[in-house]
Amino acid sequence: QAEESPFVGNPGNITGARGLTGTLRCQLQVQGEPPEVHWLRDGQILELADSTQTQVPLGEDEQDDWIVVSQLRITSLQLSDTGQYQCLVFLGHQTFVSQPGYVGLEGLPYFLEEPEDRTVAANTPFNLSCQAQGPPEPVDLLWLQDAVPLATAPGHGPQRSLHVPGLNKTSSFSCEAHNAKGVTTSRTATITVLPQQPRNLHLVSRQPTELEVAWTPGLSGIYPLTHCTLQAVLSDDGMGIQAGEPDPPEEPLTSQASVPPHQLRLGSLHPHTPYHIRVACTSSQGPSSWTHWLPVETPEGVPLGPPENISATRNGSQAFVHWQEPRAPLQGTLLGYRLAYQGQDTPEVLMDIGLRQEVTLELQGDGSVSNLTVCVAAYTAAGDGPWSLPVPLEAWRPGQAQPVHQLVKEPSTPAFSWPHHHHHHHHHH
């Protein structure tokens, strides 16, 4: 049969509230060198135990008996500290354990989860969480809204999760945890009611450097909207924004709109350019969430200036005209040039040159028409830009280079000669 246990004192019991400090103690009497005392909790050796061991010899000789006392300190009692505690020693080839002591937790309820501050859109459902535990169990919860209980008694209403169907004003929520030892009150959570996200953001009208947009405001509870903020950002080949990134890839253009009306004119935009826009509306409680980014595009405009450096020379019945692209913004994709020439007493001739920047004209007759002038205009899909000032045809002087160009004969059919009143750009004739 086994040798008699060396333990002469076993751990006691500790029961208390969270945070309690206590000590478990065991004592043994051994002959010869005192062993190291280990502590077990629920059968598991405590590797980082806050324990102290005191050894007192009972005689002069090392081989005499020793009293060994081991004390385990529990500094701030937690649920994880609860269980059955024993001392463990190895003596020779035998293992001895003390009788067990028990550590229990009993006190006011302890919150594992408390309601958190949050923002919600007006009239939008949400949930709040609260969780508490003993011991002692059971723990019953009572929810309060603006300090008013939401049930007749603890345990009768919602427990861990409170479903709120919607709020129209900023409110406070807390929960009370009740057990046999008393009541603990959670923190008070402030639920801030923000405006709902605006809806139906859309374009009202488009101009090359201007977009007019409108939207429908969401509900904002008892708090009127103070303003709405619109952001526009250049679309970077659709990467960031369309992939659902919450923030634009570059600094957006931001405009504020007084409300109502829920409409805004965005100016100073680039023509023929894709943008993404979004809107959020603000009350005294804060801003709504942004709408999704809406892709929009400014339309093309006409070129803002005439072609540059026009030169026109004449040699008999031929005229050579060349020019350069307008320096002013094109406001779109350049589709080509129109050229008009006219003599003093002859009708104006209008031609579409396409994208070339030079042309050789075959003039009618022997070239005796006097005071010939040429005008050039650039055009985009949106229409013609301004015409250049008329450039007189200078006589060609020997020695001047005369490049060989495709000849463009003056049309003999009147289809190419537009009536004068159509030439609203052409006021100089």
Partner: antibody, heavy 116, light 106 residues
Framework: QVQLVQSGAEVKKPGASVKVSCKAS????????INWVRQAPGQGLEWMGW????????KYNEKFKGRVTMTRDTSISTAYMELSRLRSDDTAVYYC?????????WGQGTLVTVSS | EIVLTQSPATLSLSPGERATLSCSAS?????MYWYQQKPGQAPRLLIY???NLASGIPARFSGSGSGTDYTLTISSLEPEDFAVYYC?????????FGQGTKLEIK
């Protein structure tokens, strides 16, 4: 000397239950935890849980919760492990082992075969 | 749970040679325990509290290590040492075992 002697081999059908016993001697039975560890054929060791005979308190591995029950009879220094709703993958040798923060003494093992 | 990984899975040595078995824990632990198992037998405790020799175990067995890396050393192999060796931890629940190292005669 410390000894743990287990009951004999069992053959069970899927869905049935098995109850294995472990008789302790050579030490104060109520002072030390009795653990159950199983070993499937050609496999490693898997801890199932413990019982403290002094109080009857138990702790089970989450994997076996709901299927395993550990009990003891202090008058005959015997611990029991019952496993219910047996499946073919419960075929294993089941060991009882005394623990003092580790497993210092083991029973000889009980082979449980689950087969239809 | 803490996973223990033993290496090598198989170790082939001759009697008289030195054997070094390793056990690596997936997170830091305080103590390691080692067991020997022979075919048809229950495991037997060899080393407790990382480095203490269990009752009746020859002094050629020793254990060491800390943190996540632990070692069982057999200084000079005897024929009866060829078996499967398991490491085990109980620093956190549940207690877990390594998958074993088979020590076989070369």
């Amino acid at each position: 000397q410390v000894q743990l002697v287990q009951s004999g081999a069992e053959v069970k059908k899927p869905g049935a239950s098995v109850k294995v016993s472990c008789k302790a001697s050579g030490y104060p039975f109520t002072d030390f935890y009795i653990n159950w560890v199983r070993q499937a054929p050609g496999q490693g060791l898997e801890w199932m849980g413990w019982i403290y005979p002094g109080s009857g308190n138990t702790k089970y591995n989450e994997k076996f919760k709901g299927r395993v029950t550990m009990t003891r009879d202090t008058s005959i220094s015997t611990a029991y492990m019952e496993l219910s709703r047996l499946r073919s993958d419960d075929t294993a040798v089941y060991y009882c082992a005394r623990s003092t923060g580790f497993f210092d003494y083991w029973g000889q093992g009980t082979l449980v075969t689950v087969s239809s | 749970e803490i996973v223990l990984t033993q290496s090598p899975a198989t170790l082939s040595l001759s009697p008289g040679e030195r054997a070094t078995l390793s056990c690596s824990a997936s997170s830091s632990i305080g103590y390691m325990y080692w067991y020997q198992q022979k075919p048809g037998q229950a495991p037997r405790l060899l080393i407790y509290l990382t480095s203490n020799l269990a009752s009746g175990i020859p002094a050629r067995f020793s254990g060491s290590g800390s943190g996540t890396d632990y070692t069982l050393t057999i200084s000079s192999l005897e024929p009866e040492d060829f078996a499967v060796y398991y490491c085990q931890q109980w620093s956190s629940n549940p207690p877990t075992f390594g998958q074993g190292t088979k020590l076989e005669i070369k």
